[in-house]
């Protein structure tokens, strides 16, 4: 009689994560007597997957009834497959021995590959806010997919972006992979309502890409524009001066009125109005008692927006002149040091 052969007919088996893998194995003879064991990997570090004789293997079931005397089918099913199960599986016949069974013959091995979906992409933006016309970086990460081939695209408000760099790791063979991409986005004043989207397409997703989003409202800072105007006289000795704070984002804003450099009043923006583009407008007014001043008064509206250096706009109030409505024609004064805070 011919010597027993262990036949693993499948060189490779491909299974989707979460499914059951069937690993086929048959023996050509009932002799010698002895159990079958399944291992992942070869050599001394191999991992026992199933032992016909003893042990508890909750994820493994046999295709045939191994207790039947004439059984020569030693195929197994492994349930709830994950990428960690990938590897080469060997069906090994042992010969009954004393005290231990002796390895007799091994199958050629079956390589189990696992297809796994990428995780939902996570998009993160810069740690600090940036102002319009500046370029900011967004990163997108997705993990745990297999095979390695994957497509990543960036969009801003539905328009595809081209300035990005993507890496898939590791470079070599692995049971699963990760993708990391960095996109550069130029901010505009209209970006408060904008979204940046990272879209990942993979064969396992069957045409339904995964998307991660970031709202530019978390990233952008739109500095305010200031306008100081003198309103018509309320009484012969009173002048109403307003400071219009326009097109700012986020809402966090503190305004200080100064009369000839001395703090008159400080207030925090509360009842703001929202513009269509998501920015805010706010107005503060100051009632100046002209009769209390002998000389001309320099009124300054100083605004500290979102913790940035203050910007200010001044208005010269002529005490000698008969009070009438007049616009502000003085240049803005920037009490901060950063030119880009003035628009």
């Amino acid at each position: 009689e011919e010597e027993l052969q262990v036949i693993q007919p499948d060189k490779s088996v491909l299974v989707a994560a979460g499914e059951t893998a069937t690993l086929r194995c048959t023996a050509t003879s009932l002799i010698p007597v002895g159990p079958i064991q399944w291992f992942r990997g070869a050599g001394p570090g191999r991992e026992l997957i199933y032992n016909q004789k003893e042990g508890h293997f909750p994820r493994v079931t046999t295709v045939s009834d191994l207790t039947k005397r004439n059984n020569m089918d030693f195929s197994i099913r492994i349930g709830n497959i994950t990428p960690a199960d990938a590897g080469t599986y060997y069906c090994v016949k042992f010969r009954k021995g004393s005290p231990d069974d002796v390895e007799f013959k091994s199958g050629a091995g079956t390589e189990l590959s696992v297809r796994a979906k990428p995780s939902a992409p996570v998009v993160s933006g810069p740690a600090a806010r940036a102002t319009p016309q500046h370029t900011v970086s967004f990163t997108c990460e997705s993990h745990g997919f297999s095979p390695r081939d994957i497509t990543l695209k960036w969009f801003k408000n539905g328009n595809e972006l081209s300035d990005f760099q993507t890496n898939v790791d590791p470079v070599g063979e692995s049971v699963s992979y990760s993708i990391h991409s960095t996109a550069k986005v130029v901010l505009t004043r209209e970006d408060v309502h904008s979204q940046v989207i990272c879209e990942v397409a993979h064969v396992t997703l069957q045409g339904d890409p995964l998307r991660g989003t970031a709202n530019l409202s978390e990233t952008i800072r739109v500095p305010p524009t200031l306008e100081v105007t003198q309103q018509p006289v309320r009484a012969e000795n009173q002048v109403n001066v307003t400071c219009q704070v326009r097109k700012f984002y986020p809402q966090r804003l503190q305004l200080t009125w100064l009369e000839n450099g001395n703090v008159s009043r400080t207030e925090t923006a509360s009842t703001v109005t929202e513009n269509k583009d998501g920015t805010y407008n706010w107005m503060s007014w100051l009632l100046v008692n002209v009769s209390a001043h002998r000389d001309d008064v320099k009124l300054t509206c100083q605004v500290e927006h979102d913790g940035q250096p203050a910007v200010s706009k001044s208005h010269d109030l002529k005490v000698s002149a008969h009070p009438k409505e007049q616009g502000s024609n003085t240049a803005a004064e920037n009490t901060g040091s950063n030119e880009r805070n003035i628009y």
């Epitope: 989707a16 499914e19 081939d149 397409a201 396992t204 069957q206 045409g207 339904d208």
Partner: antibody, heavy 119, light 110 residues
Framework: EVQLVESGGGLVQPGGSLRLSCAAS????????MIWVRQAPGKGLEWVGI???????YYATWAKGRFTISRDNSKNTLYLQMNSLRAEDTAVYYC?????????????WGQGTLVTVSS | DIQMTQSPSSLSASVGDRVTITCQAS??????LSWYQQKPGKAPKLLIY???NLASGVPSRFSGSGSGTDFTLTISSLQPEDFATYYC????????????FGGGTKVEIK
């Protein structure tokens, strides 16, 4: 048993329209990508279009504008609406289901339905 | 769009013969290649997917190999029920999704 059954084929005049159906049983259509493939008499296989599990459709360049794939999840049925039919659209039309591991292969096929475009 | 070139377009072989069919993609498709068997009047049947994986219920005499642009289907010992037409099919994505079939190889009895 997992099965696909096409229907709706027949004789149609050039310029006419036809709607093919593909009834699925043994699985939910909304969990797999589904493809339409056609085969002209004595010729090879040609993909027409595909629908993703969420209902997004993709078409072969030549099929865009004339052919529309849709799905009725409540009836577990896939459709192929064919308009402005030409003689060269004469073929057996197959629907097929993508594998669970991805939409690069198709492991369940219907028996096909013959569409003849002729005056 | 990607083109799949299958060869030969037909071949004659005897039962027990080893048969090899090749498929070439016009650009790299990684391992996204499937093989189907079709008998007259019947629907195609999946044999091999992802270049080398045997579909459920397919005899082990069928095997597939290759990656990139060149792929092979091998029938180690041709059986009477294997006389049929065989098609390769690719999946590819660049700017849009694309599935393409080869022209087919008819395996006839010698």
């Amino acid at each position: 048993e997992v099965q696909l059954v096409e229907s709706g084929g027949g004789l149609v005049q050039p310029g006419g329209s036809l709607r093919l159906s593909c009834a699925a049983s043994g699985f939910s259509l909304s969990t797999y990508a589904m493809i339409w493939v056609r085969q002209a008499p004595g010729k090879g296989l040609e993909w027409v279009g595909i629908i993703s599990p969420s209902g997004t459709t993709y078409y072969a360049t030549w099929a865009k504008g004339r052919f529309t794939i849709s799905r009725d999840n409540s009836k577990n049925t896939l459709y192929l609406q064919m308009n402005s039919l030409r003689a060269e659209d004469t073929a057996v039309y197959y629907c097929a289901r993508a594998g669970s591991g991805g939409w690069d292969y198709f492991n369940i096929w219907g028996q096909g339905t013959l569409v003849t475009v002729s005056s | 769009d990607i083109q799949m070139t299958q060869s030969p377009s037909s071949l004659s072989a005897s039962v027990g013969d080893r048969v090899t069919i090749t498929c070439q993609a016009s650009q790299s498709i990684s391992s996204y290649l499937s093989w189907y068997q079709q008998k007259p009047g019947k629907a195609p049947k999946l044999l091999i997917y992802y270049a080398s994986n045997l579909a459920s219920g397919v005899p082990s005499r069928f095997s597939g190999s290759g990656s990139g642009t060149d792929f092979t289907l091998t029938i180690s010992s041709l059986q009477p029920e294997d006389f049929a037409t065989y098609y390769c099919q690719s999946y590819y994505y660049s700017n849009n999704y694309n599935w393409a079939f080869g022209g087919g190889t008819k395996v006839e009895i010698k």
